[in-house]
Interface confidence: low
């Protein structure tokens, strides 16, 4: 808290310029108007301010809108959001992925913070759903994003949206949120040819049931490996050894290396060992 | 319905060190054990910390960071607190904390369900 004092004569800003990175914690507080503040942040983040001198600006704007800062005056916060707590954003009412991006690219290159945690959580919350503009944004900044949220959040995503997903933005889901993921990724692709298909729905696979591995069998579709690795346990027991086999295509080979890891170690022991020995890769169940 | 069941308090000289674990049962899959907070004799219950659903985002009170980390399961149902470089001033009665929503979070507000608590006391 910053005592209150009077401006000193001739002190009183009259814009928000250089010149007042040589007042004082206290002038900046006595001599800088709060509303000349909000009307003129975009002009904050080209004035070298201390850390100190924007704990003394984040509390005039507090001081302004107890009950959180308008959208007008968040869309050009700029580092002044980095004084944010979780608490404060909470507060706030963001609507446009304008103002979504601004303060994305203020914490571009670090870690996903619990400040901007919050601000996407209160950004999607307002929208209902998350939409494929939203989506791209977010992958864009933090490639993680869809595998942190919970599988009840991702069933407000819209199959539409799937198209903005890339391959790495799934690396680190798990398999509950591709059970949620994969219907819709179907739903999605369901109108492109085959092999166009499979290098689209590769990375949602792990969510997907027997019968539409057995489908893929069909198709000469040439799984690799990793792929069949991250597959559901419960939806490859009941492919057969053709079935896999087919899935498979050339890669059919790297299942003697996998042998002892699930899925593969489950699958074998439920498979005919007359079946397995037709693989000629030595596979023992 | 959400059942936080913590373990792993106990007496610990100063420097020593304590892993404590949170297990959830029940609705788990919408409310989820994402958080640690304490509770000092005479206190009020303050934030520890909090880990969001990914399991990558993580946020720490500044009195335990570089000292504590919270880690979770990849069935996303146990919450884990390590707690190494304890201090006299650590000791409390810790509780677990389940909410709903990804982002990791220090506002009790924002938790749903509370574990009966785990006491850690550090004294030489």
């Known amino acids: 808290e910053v005592e209150k004092t009077a401006c000193p004569s001739g002190k009183k800003a009259r814009e928000i310029d250089e010149s007042l990175i040589f007042y004082k914690k206290w002038e900046l507080e006595a001599c800088v108007d709060a509303a000349l503040l909000a009307t003129q942040m975009d002009r904050v983040n080209a004035i070298p301010f201390t850390y100190e001198q924007l704990d003394v600006l984040k509390h005039k704007l507090d001081e302004l809108y107890p009950q959180g800062y308008p959208e007008s005056v968040i869309q050009h916060l700029g580092y002044l959001f980095l004084k944010m707590s979780p608490e404060d954003i909470r507060k706030w009412n963001v609507t446009s992925l304008e103002t979504l991006k601004a303060l994305l690219e203020v914490n571009k290159g670090h870690e996903m913070s619990p400040q901007v945690a919050t601000l996407i959580d209160r950004f999607v919350k307002g929208r209902g759903q998350l939409d494929k503009d939203t989506l791209d944004t977010l992958t864009a900044f933090y490639p993680g994003y869809l595998c942190s949220l919970s599988p009840e959040e991702l069933s407000s995503v819209p199959p539409s949206s799937i198209w903005a997903v890339r391959p790495q933005d799934l690396d680190t889901c798990d398999p509950r949120q591709l059970d949620v993921l994969y219907p819709k990724a179907r739903l999605a692709f369901q109108n492109m040819n085959g092999s166009e298909y499979f290098v689209k729905i590769q990375s949602f696979l792990g969510g997907a049931p027997t019968e539409d591995l057995k489908a893929l069998s069909q198709q000469n579709v040439s799984m690799d490996l990793a792929t069949f690795m991250k597959l559901r346990t419960d939806a490859v027991l009941p492919l057969t050894v053709a079935e896999v086999q087919k899935l498979l295509g050339p890669h059919v080979e790297g299942l003697k290396a996998e042998e002892r890891h699930r899925p593969v170690r489950d699958w074998i022991l439920r498979q005919r060992q007359d079946d397995l020995d037709t693989l000629g890769l030595g596979l023992q169940g | 319905q959400v059942q936080l069941q913590e373990s792993g308090g106990g007496l610990v000289q100063p420097g020593g060190s304590l892993t404590l674990s949170c297990e959830a049962s029940g609705h788990t899959d919408s409310y989820y054990p994402k958080a640690w907070f304490r509770q000092a004799p005479g206190k009020e219950r303050e934030f520890v910390a909090s880990i969001g659903w990914g399991g990558r985002m993580t946020a720490y009170a500044d009195s335990v960071k570089g000292r504590f980390t919270v880690s979770r399961t990849y069935a996303k149902n146990t919450v884990y607190l390590q707690m190494n470089s304890l201090k006299p001033e650590d000791t409390a009665v810790y509780y677990c904390?389940?909410?709903?929503?990804?982002?990791?979070?220090?506002?009790?507000?924002?938790?749903?369900?509370w574990g009966q608590g785990t006491q850690v006391t550090v004294s030489s």
């Open positions: 904390a389940a909410g709903i929503g990804w982002a990791p979070t220090a506002d009790s507000g924002e938790y749903d369900y």
